[in-house]
C-alpha cells in the first residue's frame, strides 16, 4: 500500500516534543537524527491514518508508532496493529473508528526500534484534523423565473460542517465561491437563461465541533441549462449525464440531479 | 498591457526541489484565478495547478498532487508553484496563466529541467 | 478524466483557404471547450471560449462550433499569420482540465 504523505495546516496549537539523548557534539549518532513528523488525518470520523515520510530516514527503517490518550480513561499505552507501507517500510498507521476519541489529546509516539532512544512524541487535536467526505446527492429546484436553490448532503452530522459553494458558467475563466453555514443550501438568485452552469460543493469540520482546516474533496458537479435556454431561458435542456425527476416522484418540486446521484437515489 | 513573467527555472537532480515565480502587470490580479500549464518542448500542453481568486482553492494534476503547491500573494501581484521530489518527467516548460477554467493571457514560460 | 481528442493531428493548406479542426470528448462537455492557437517559441493564445465565443482582439475569421463531444474550429480564410498548432480544451470536469493533442498546421 502507497501512502500520500499530506501536510496539515490545521493543527497549529498541537504541541510537539522530542525527546533525543543528548550526545557530545564531536560523536554523531544516529540516536541524534530528528525522526519525521507524524501526520494525522481523521476521515469522517470513520478511521484515522497517521503517517511519517519513510523516506525521510537515511537508510530504509521500519519505524514503530505507539499511541495513547493524555489525562483519559484511555491512556494505555496503544502499539499500532495495523501499519501502511510505502515500498516495503512501515510509513503510516491506520486507526480504526473505535480507537478516535475525537475530544481528548491524542499523544503519538514514533520511535527506530533499532534506536530506541530515538524516538519522538506528538501530541494532536483531533477535532481539529477531521476530514469529511465529498458532498453528495446534489439537487437543483428553480425557486422562481431567475433563482436557483443548490441542495445537498453529508454522511455526517450536518451542523457539524461548513461548506463552501463555487459556482461558473461556460463563460467563467474562474469560479464564484460563497461560503454557506451548516444549513447545506445555497441559492444564486439571479441565474443568466443564455448561459450554462456548473455548481460544485465541499465541506470542512468547522467551527462548531471543532477547528478543522483541511476541506473535503469536491463533489461531483451538478449542471444547468443548455442551448435551448437561447430559444427559451427558463426551458432547460438538460444534457446527457443529468435526468429530471417528474413531479410525483419528489412530492410537487422538480429537482435536477446528477446521473450518479439518480441512480443513487433509485437503488439505495 | 497584460503581462505574465515566469523566472525560477533551472536545472535539477531528480528529488530535489524548485520555486517557480510568476510576476504580472496590466491587470487586477485579485479578479482572476491563476494556473500554471506545463509543456515539454515539442510536446502537447498539460495542466498543473490551478488556484482561486483568494488563494483559497487550489486544485492539481494527479502526476504533480502531494509534490507540488500553487499559492499567490495578491499583493504583490505573483504566483508561485513549489515544486518538491521533482521527476524526470517533470522537465518542461511552465507557463502561467491567467484564469482556472481556461486561460486568457500566458507568460513566455521558464524552463526546468530534472536531471542525474 | 476526459479525453479529448483532435484531428487530424496535422494539415496542409494554401493562404486563402477555409480550414476545419475537430475537436472529440470522451464524454459529453456542454459547451465548456475552448481553442488555443501556438505559434513556434511563443506562448499558446486564446481564440475561442465556450465553444463559439470569439476572445477580445481575435480576427473574425475564426470561428468555433459544436455541443456534447463534437466540435470544430473554422477558419474561414487562411492567412499567412494563421499557420501555427491549436489545441482544444475542455473545462467540463475539473480537476483536471485536459488539452487535445494539438493539430500543426502548415504551409502547403
Known amino acids: 500500500l502507497n501512502t500520500t504523505i499530506l501536510t496539515p495546516n490545521g493543527n497549529e496549537d498541537a504541541t510537539t516534543d522530542f525527546f533525543l539523548t543528548s550526545m557530545p557534539t564531536d560523536s554523531l549518532s544516529v540516536s541524534t537524527l530528528p525522526l519525521p513528523e507524524v501526520q494525522c488525518f481523521v476521515f469522517n470520523v470513520e478511521y484515522m491514518n497517521c503517517t511519517w515520510n519513510s523516506s525521510s530516514e537515511p537508510q530504509p527503517t521500519n519505524l514503530t508508532l505507539h499511541y495513547w490518550y493524555k489525562n483519559s480513561d484511555n491512556d494505555k499505552v496503544q502499539k499500532c496493529s495495523h501499519y501502511l507501507f510505502s515500498e516495503e517500510i512501515t510509513s503510516g498507521c491506520q486507526l480504526q473508528k473505535k480507537e478516535i476519541h475525537l475530544y481528548q489529546t491524542f499523544v503519538v509516539q514514533l520511535q527506530d526500534p533499532r534506536e530506541p532512544r530515538r524516538q519522538a512524541t506528538q501530541m494532536l487535536k483531533l477535532q481539529n484534523l477531521v476530514i469529511p467526505w465529498a458532498p453528495e446527492n446534489l439537487t437543483l429546484r428553480k425557486l422562481s423565473e431567475s433563482q436557483l436553490e443548490l441542495n445537498w448532503n453529508n454522511r455526517f452530522l450536518n451542523h457539524c460542517l461548513e461548506h463552501l459553494v463555487q459556482y461558473r458558467t461556460d463563460w467563467d475563466h474562474s469560479w464564484t465561491e460563497q461560503s454557506v453555514d451548516y444549513r447545506h443550501k445555497f441559492s444564486l438568485p439571479s441565474v443568466d437563461g443564455q448561459k450554462r452552469y456548473t455548481f460544485r460543493v465541499r465541506s470542512r469540520f468547522n467551527p462548531l465541533c471543532g477547528s478543522a482546516q483541511h476541506w473535503s474533496e469536491w463533489s461531483h458537479p451538478i449542471h444547468w441549462g443548455s442551448n435551448s435556454s437561447k430559444e427559451n431561458p427558463f426551458l432547460f435542456a438538460l444534457e446527457a449525464e443529468q435526468k429530471l425527476i417528474s413531479e410525483e416522484d419528489l412530492g410537487g418540486e422538480q429537482k435536477l440531479i446528477s446521473e450518479e446521484d439518480l441512480h443513487h437515489h433509485h437503488h439505495h | 498591457e497584460v503581462q505574465l513573467v515566469e523566472s525560477g527555472g533551472g536545472v535539477v537532480r531528480p528529488g530535489g526541489s524548485l520555486r517557480l515565480s510568476c510576476a504580472t502587470s496590466?491587470?487586477?490580479?485579485?479578479?482572476?484565478?491563476m494556473s500554471w500549464v506545463r509543456q515539454v518542448p515539442g510536446k502537447g500542453l498539460e495542466w498543473v495547478s490551478s488556484v482561486n481568486r483568494n488563494g483559497g482553492t487550489t486544485d492539481y494534476a494527479d502526476s504533480v498532487k502531494g509534490r507540488f503547491t500553487i499559492s499567490r500573494d495578491n499583493a504583490k501581484r505573483s504566483l508561485f508553484l513549489q515544486m518538491n521530489s521533482l521527476r524526470a518527467e517533470d522537465t518542461a516548460l511552465y507557463h502561467c496563466a491567467t484564469g482556472e477554467l481556461f486561460f486568457d493571457y500566458w507568460g513566455q514560460g521558464t524552463l526546468v529541467t530534472v536531471s542525474s | 478524466d476526459i479525453q479529448m481528442t483532435q484531428s487530424p493531428s496535422s494539415l496542409s493548406a494554401s493562404v486563402g483557404d477555409r480550414v476545419t479542426i475537430t475537436c472529440r470528448a470522451s464524454?459529453?462537455?456542454?459547451?465548456?471547450l475552448n481553442w488555443y492557437q501556438q505559434k513556434p517559441g511563443k506562448a499558446p493564445k486564446l481564440l475561442i471560449y465556450a465553444a463559439s465565443s470569439l476572445q477580445s482582439g481575435v480576427p473574425s475569421r475564426f470561428s468555433g462550433s459544436g455541443s456534447g463531444t463534437d466540435f470544430t474550429l473554422t477558419i474561414s480564410s487562411l492567412q499567412p499569420e494563421d499557420f501555427a498548432t491549436y489545441y482544444c480544451?475542455?473545462?467540463?470536469?475539473?480537476?483536471?482540465?485536459?488539452f487535445g493533442q494539438g493539430t500543426r498546421l502548415e504551409i502547403k
Open positions: 464524454q459529453s462537455i456542454s459547451s465548456y
Open positions: 480544451q475542455q473545462s467540463y470536469s475539473t480537476p483536471p482540465i485536459t
Open positions: 496590466g491587470f487586477t490580479f485579485d479578479d482572476y484565478g
